[in-house]
Interface confidence: low
């Protein structure tokens, strides 16, 4: 007998064809011989099957000798052998309905596990293969698991169920809830205003939750909460903020924080956490602040940086349009008795300048000027 695979929730059309190309009497029954539907003249009649108003046919095809059975909103329990009785013949079609669902929710936090569960009719032995949006293939039986979801796992997962040499394809949209960047670093000169942005890597109609920014200043022995806030339908409202520094927060997404000014005592690392309503776990984004200060004290010109810099970063002091006078993989460099002119302090990574601060050194009889 013919085997047809169907998807839970979908519509399937089982065909039944008579040799006579005209409307004649037909009946569709299930394996228990319970009538599903049939015709009486040009009328469609329905039997007492559990398919009820989910069963239909196409009357427009009857005149061509085609008497399909359409089953809407398929359920696993609809898996059965369906018999079409027409012209003293019986056509049997075995319908196997499969369902593939993601564990609890299709919106998962980064780092969580995704479990795909296959619902299948009794007696079937399907195999499943799924392909992630980044091309990773996983195979399994009734359940497939992927641990430690990453941002790249967001998108459409395509799963193929194979049974009786026939296949049915499922597409499941998975949204990995995460910030666009796991970590970011901001480089600022002392005194400049600092902007921190925390864009999300997903969009949902309603976003509700609460968040907090904890800050570990390089100079401090312990971390402290700089700001706590609520998120209601994408509207941000500040619950509590420290007095020093007094952060400002944007009222709309993306989450946006403004530090009034960069100071050495603020340099360090922060961790913004966002707890979303109805989700276990939190979203995290690390943010780092590096602050530069250039000073001249008597006969000493000093350039310093505070905050999390990598050991390969180079700190240099040079007179404008001249070679670097001093260049070190350290957090402070200085020049004794600097000659007059515009000096540049540069923080660079493999030749790329990340931060620059200029200081004008005047002849020894006057005081220095910081532009």
């Amino acid at each position: 007998k013919k085997v047809v695979l169907g998807k839970k929730g979908d519509t399937v059309e089982l065909t039944c064809t008579a040799s006579q190309k005209k409307s004649i009497q037909f009946h569709w029954k299930n394996s228990n011989q319970i009538k599903i539907l049939g015709n009486q003249g040009s009328f469609l009649t329905k039997g007492p099957s559990k398919l009820n108003d989910r069963a239909d046919s196409r009357r427009s095809l009857w005149d061509q000798g085609n008497f399909p059975l359409i089953i809407k909103n398929l359920k696993i329990e609809d898996s059965d052998t369906y018999i079409c009785e027409v012209e003293d013949q019986k056509e049997e079609v075995q319908l196997l309905v499969f369902g593939l669902t993601a564990n609890s929710d299709t919106h998962l936090l980064q780092g969580q596990s995704l479990t795909l569960t296959l619902e299948s009719p009794p007696g079937s032995s399907p195999s499943v293969q799924c392909r992630s949006p980044r091309g990773k293939n996983i195979q399994g039986g009734k359940t497939l698991s992927v641990s430690q979801l990453e941002l790249q796992d967001s998108g459409t997962w395509t799963c193929t169920v194979l049974q009786n040499q026939k296949k049915v394809e499922f597409k499941i949209d998975i949204v990995v809830l995460a910030f666009q960047k796991a970590s970011s670093i901001v480089y600022k000169k002392e005194g400049e205003q600092v902007e921190f942005s925390f864009p999300l890597a997903f969009t949902v109609e309603k976003l509700t939750g609460s968040g907090e920014l904890w800050w570990q200043a390089e100079r401090a022995s312990s971390s402290k909460s700089w700001i706590t806030f609520d998120l209601k339908n994408k509207e941000v409202s500040v619950k509590r903020v420290t007095q020093d520094p007094k952060l400002q927060m944007g009222k709309k997404l993306p989450l946006h924080l403004t530090l009034p000014q960069a100071l050495p005592q603020y340099a360090g690392s922060g961790n913004l956490t966002l707890a979303l309503e109805a989700k276990t776990g939190k979203l995290h984004q690390e943010v780092n602040l590096v602050v530069m200060r250039a000073t001249q004290l008597q006969k000493n010109l000093t350039c310093e940086v505070w905050g999390p810099t990598s050991p390969k970063l180079m700190l240099s002091l040079k007179l404008e349009n001249k070679e670097a006078k001093v260049s070190k993989r350290e957090k402070a460099v200085w020049v004794l008795n600097p000659e007059a002119g515009m000096w540049q302090c540069l923080l660079s990574d493999s030749g790329q300048v990340l931060l620059e601060s200029n200081i004008k050194v005047l002849p020894t009889w006057s005081t220095p000027v910081q532009p």
């Epitope: 469609l44 329905k46 009820n52 108003d53 239909d56 046919s57 196409r58 009357r59 359920k75």
Partner: antibody, heavy 118, light 111 residues
Framework: QVQLVQSGAEVKKPGASVKVSCKAS????????IHWVKQATGQGLEWIGE????????YSNAKFKDRVTITADKSTNTAYMELRSLRSDDTAVYFC???????????WGQGTLVTVSS | DIVLTQSPASLAVSLGQRATITCKAG??????????MNWYQQKPGQPPKLLIY???NLESGIPARFSGSGSGTDFTLNIHPVEENDAATYYC?????????FGQGTKLEIK
């Protein structure tokens, strides 16, 4: 908002036919089944049948099957119920109805009184 | 056809008291964990108004004084506390199988 507006009252002679209309608005007409329900004066409710406006597939109660035709016109968002070979016991109010989000009839027409009298 | 038998045929309840109407189906109307029974209120000259769907779900805009319960073949509609405005005829209806059928109705009078 969802509205079902039915045609006006009719007086018919026994043996004649009547065609009651039900104009839908406030939603996508082809997305929902339209049902027809009969209520004889002072009596209970009786389901006549239904139509899927998108496909034109209609199903009716065996009790009415030989005398009823349910149709729909997608261009005007209107469903029709025609009852033939009218008898005096067909005197009733005929309602069209539509399901809500659940399985019950959440939306109803105002009803059309059909009187069959010689 | 599934026959639905409502009882009582009529009842009179004092204002603020509880009204209980039962509906017995000729066969189970349960499927896949749901009970396909609905309840309606009808006042003279008006179409019926959906109160409860799938046995216990309150239709939007219906006060919580109305509640439905039951499964299989036995279902109940409760109104508590009864208000003057509740005087009407109440019908149960199964949406489990064609032909859809209604109970014969219960007339509620407020004392």
């Amino acid at each position: 908002q969802v509205q079902l507006v039915q045609s006006g009252a009719e007086v018919k002679k026994p043996g004649a036919s009547v065609k009651v209309s039900c104009k839908a608005s406030g939603y996508t007409f082809t997305d929902y089944v339209i049902h027809w329900v009969k209520q004889a004066t002072g009596q209970g409710l009786e389901w006549i049948g239904e139509i899927y406006p998108g496909s034109g597939s209609a199903y009716s109660n065996a009790k009415f099957k030989d005398r009823v035709t349910i149709t729909a016109d997608k261009s005007t968002n209107t469903a029709y119920m025609e009852l033939r070979s009218l008898r005096s016991d067909d005197t009733a109010v005929y309602f069209c109805a539509r399901r809500g989000n659940g399985t019950g009839f959440a939306y109803w027409g105002q009803g059309t009184l059909v009187t069959v009298s010689s | 056809d599934i026959v639905l038998t409502q009882s009582p045929a009529s009842l009179a309840v004092s204002l603020g008291q509880r009204a209980t109407i039962t509906c017995k189906a000729g066969q189970s109307v349960d499927y896949d964990g749901d009970s396909y029974m609905n309840w309606y209120q009808q006042k003279p000259g008006q179409p019926p108004k959906l109160l409860i769907y799938v046995a216990s779900n309150l239709e939007s805009g219906i006060p919580a004084r109305f509640s439905g319960s039951g499964s299989g073949t036995d279902f109940t509609l409760n109104i508590h506390p009864v208000e003057e405005n509740d005087a009407a005829t109440y019908y149960c209806q199964q949406s489990y199988k064609d032909p859809l059928t209604f109970g014969q109705g219960t007339k509620l009078e407020i004392k």
